[in-house]
């Protein structure tokens, strides 16, 4: 009776089990019943960094210089190439897709310390009572505007991303 | 494609004056913070000033405080930086840089020389 699952490291074609190709190598060929899984090693500047039937190895990461990126750590057949800023200068996300020379601030978020040369732009939230509703690098959060001082009443409650919206008091008649 | 185009250095003597200026294009001008950065001759960046889009907020280094003024006329789609009471010490290429501050958010800057 054909299988219906597989080991680990398999994989189930043709109603049988075949080998998956080993990291830093592609699938030429399914095996048969007479022969083995056919694999070839990744080419230059390409890997594959998982038990695989993978048909293509992928292209290494480009470590941009004209976004001011560059190789942190060489790929192989098995990893990617790591790419990383260049000096005093700031990756945009995890995978260091693009650099910044300093982070700004979401809404919401207000800039708790200015970058320098060495450091990135530290944020923090807004509590309560403060807001921030632009990106910013260098601005903090705001205080609330204070309606009573106004001698107005609060007509819509400010949140972290906005402020609260003052409005004449009811009048007794 | 964001165009920054920084105009105004030159070689003043110290206690001198100088107003650059940015024109930018390419890019909504009015929704923007701006940055006035510069780099010393061997030395890293240094951010000197910063203004929110709607000119009502600016940032100073405390090497440029009382000194520099930033300001910003978003009909003109234009940044300034005054410059006065010049220091050996500001000779640098001054570049204008928008938020996010990515390689494509700079101009090409303009060199201050400070010299007696």
């Known amino acids: 009776e054909p299988p219906t699952a597989c080991r680990e490291k398999q994989y189930l074609i043709n109603s049988q089990c075949c080998s998956l190709c080993q990291p830093g190598q592609k699938l030429v060929s399914d095996c048969t019943e007479f022969t083995e899984t056919e694999c070839l090693p990744c080419g230059e500047s390409e890997f594959l960094d998982t038990w695989n039937r993978e048909t293509h190895c992928h292209q290494h990461k480009y470590c941009d210089p004209n976004l001011g990126l560059r190789v942190q750590q060489k790929g192989t057949s098995e990893t990617d190439t790591i790419c990383t800023c260049e000096e005093g200068w700031h990756c945009t996300s995890e995978a260091c897709e693009s650099c910044v020379l300093h982070r700004s601030c979401s809404p919401g978020f207000g800039v708790k310390q200015i970058a320098t040369g060495v450091s990135d732009t530290i944020c923090e939230p807004c509590p309560v009572g403060f807001f921030s509703n632009v990106s910013s690098a260098f601005e903090k959060c705001h205080p609330w505007t204070s309606c009573e001082t106004k001698d107005l009443v609060v007509q819509q409650a400010g949140t972290n991303k906005t402020d609260v919206v003052c409005g004449p008091q009811d009048r007794l008649r | 494609e964001v165009q920054l185009l920084e105009s105004g250095g030159g070689l003043v003597q110290p206690g001198g004056s100088l107003r650059l200026s940015c024109a930018a294009s390419g890019f909504t001008f009015r929704d923007y913070e701006m940055w006035w950065v510069r780099q010393a001759p061997g030395k890293g960046l240094e951010r000197v000033s910063?203004?929110?889009?709607?000119?009502?907020?600016?940032y100073y280094a405390d090497s440029v405080k009382g000194r520099f003024t930033i300001s910003r006329d978003n009909s003109k789609n234009t940044l300034y930086l005054q410059m006065n009471s010049l220091r050996a010490e500001d000779t640098a290429v001054y570049y204008c840089a928008k938020l996010p501050f990515t390689f494509d958010d700079w101009g090409q800057g303009t060199l201050v020389t400070v010299s007696s």
């Open positions: 910063a203004i929110n889009p709607w000119g009502s907020h600016t």
